[in-house]
Amino acid sequence: CKAMHVAQPAVVLASSRGIASFVCEYASPGKATEVRVTVLRQADSQVTEVCAATYMMGNELTFLDDSICTGTSSGNQVNLTIQGLRAMDTGLYICKVELMYPPPYYLGIGNGTQIYVIDPEPCPDSDF
């Protein structure tokens, strides 16, 4: 397994609708044609997988139908969007990139993006 550098922003604030977007950029040592991108969440020293997608270079990222993630790719950059976030989902979101083809296999893990989610205040009751 060969190591690869992955860069991602340190901090992102989710929108009031619970949507957070960030760019995951990897330093590809060669011309990879099949790439796997995984988003992991680290909170209280516990790591869980949020979503994952394998894509062929030049094609769209395809996450599972029930995934909370969507994304697009451009060169060595992946634009990731996570939706449906609530305050309890605040945590460190780590981008993992694997170059699956051609050999050799490369694995890169970013330092993580701290996503802050603030639940919107409920609207006050209207008098009319």
Epitope: C1, T33, E34, R36, T38, L40, V47, E49, A52, T54, M56, I94, K96, E98, M100, Y101, P102, Y105, L107, I109
Partner: nanobody
Framework: EVQLVESGGGLVQPGGSLRLSCAAS????????MGWYRQAPGNQRDLVAS???????YYADSVKGRFTISRDGAKNTVYLQMNSLKPEDTAVYYC?????????????WGQGTQVTVSS
């Protein structure tokens, strides 16, 4: 823990064929590169063929046109069909699953199966 069990090796004459099988414990094909490596006495372990989750196949130059890698997701098994075998194909063949689990790389090996090509 992933377990890989190879079978199908044996003694075959030059020009003959063999099919190696590698049975995996669980469906690991969706996130692992499955590969066949071989190691002849006194040599290092070399990649012969591999198949990715997306179905991309790689072959070493020495086996192109003679060997075919395939997989059966329903049986959790990966195969290596070896045709037109040569004496220089003699080696121990190992099945490999390579990928990652959460933040850690993973690299699993089978116990190996001997292939001998001799008249």
């Amino acid at each position: 823990e992933v377990q890989l069990v190879e079978s199908g090796g044996g003694l075959v004459q030059p020009g003959g064929s063999l099919r190696l099988s590698c049975a995996a414990s669980g469906n690991i094909f969706t996130r692992n590169i499955m590969g066949w490596y071989r190691q002849a006495p006194g040599n290092q372990r070399d990649l012969v063929a591999s198949i990715t989750p997306g179905g991309n196949m790689y072959y070493a130059d020495s086996v192109k046109g003679r060997f075919t890698i395939s997989r059966d997701g329903a049986k959790n098994t990966v195969y290596l069909q070896m045709n037109s075998l040569k004496p220089e194909d003699t080696a121990v063949y190992y099945c490999n699953a390579r990928g990652s689990i959460l933040l850690d790389p993973s690299n699993y090996w089978g116990q190996g199966t001997q292939v001998t090509v001799s008249s």
